[in-house]
């Protein structure tokens, strides 16, 4: 069964910078990746970035850079402009659309006890839905 994993990482050098890493574990080719925050895409979450293997990427503040890391994983750099750190309590969700499997989505957040520079373990957390 295909699975999606999500890591949220605080940068050690800049405490206002976060990176979301997402990956797809399964067969099939990725046709689209959507990263949202505040909840799943289409269920109360706001799109932060959309990555297409051919059409390119679109991103919106506070996302700074979205890029492919491998053919089945992406990273999204975020810049926290606020004085406090709202990202620390925010849920980030990644949805991978794969042909012919369908869509798979998982969510994650920064671990409460995580030190700067340390990320959540890349444990697959297959939640929500498979369209």
């Amino acid at each position: 069964t295909p699975e999606v994993w999500v890591q949220v990482q605080m940068e050690a050098t800049e405490l206002s910078s976060f990176t979301v890493h997402c990956g797809f574990l399964g067969p099939g080719s990725i046709s689209l990746v959507t990263v949202s925050w505040g909840g799943p895409d289409g269920a109360g979450g706001t799109k932060l970035a959309v990555l297409h293997p051919e059409l390119g990427t679109r991103q919106w503040a506070p996302a700074r850079q979205a890029r492919w890391e491998t053919q089945s994983s992406i990273s999204l750099a975020l810049e926290d402009s606020g004085a406090s750190s709202p990202f620390a309590n925010t849920t980030f969700c990644c949805k991978f659309a794969s042909f012919p499997e369908g869509s798979w989505e998982s969510c994650g957040s920064l671990p409460p006890s995580s030190d700067p520079g340390l990320s959540a373990p890349p444990t697959p957390v297959p939640i929500l839905r498979a369209d």
């Epitope: 046709s31 689209l32 505040g38 909840g39 895409d41 289409g42 109360g44 979450g45 706001t46 799109k47 959309v50 297409h52 059409l55 390119g56 679109r58 919106w60 659309a97 869509s103 369209d131």
Partner: nanobody, 127 residues
């Protein structure tokens, strides 16, 4: 709940121009649809697709408006525009904004898979 609100309709003379706008809003979050599109329905006729634009900026147009109408989206991703030039009497219709998501981020064949619709704005082309 997602709401689409159109504006910019009105009365214009043949050969004139109009710019329609549509804003997608949602309660509690920012809705950035993969696809936003314009449709129109003339009196006594079926609704027809006019133009669509995906989240990456790719556009599709009905043959009847190619070269005259231009669809665009704002950088924030939730507003849609339609610049209509060289308007003709046959462009008279209620213009509807529609939005929805698709498996690959592109607009589906116009008229399919768009699950949110606005109330429409009237465009009348007459001398």
């Amino acid at each position: 709940h997602v709401q689409l609100v159109e504006s910019g309709g009105g009365l214009v003379q043949p050969g004139g121009s109009l710019r329609l706008s549509c804003v997608a809003s949602a309660s509690g979050f920012t809705y950035r649809p993969y696809c936003m599109a314009w449709f129109r329905q003339a009196p006594g006729k079926e609704r027809e697709a006019v133009a669509g634009i995906d989240i990456f900026g790719g556009t599709t147009y009905a043959d009847s408006v190619k070269g005259r109408f231009t669809a665009s989206r704002d950088n924030a991703g939730f507003s849609l525009y339609l610049q209509m030039n060289s308007l003709r009497a046959e462009d008279t219709a209620v213009y509807y904004c529609a939005a929805g998501d698709s498996p690959d981020g592109r607009c589906p064949p116009l008229g399919q898979g768009l699950n949110y619709w606005g109330q429409g704005t009237m465009v009348t082309v007459s001398s």
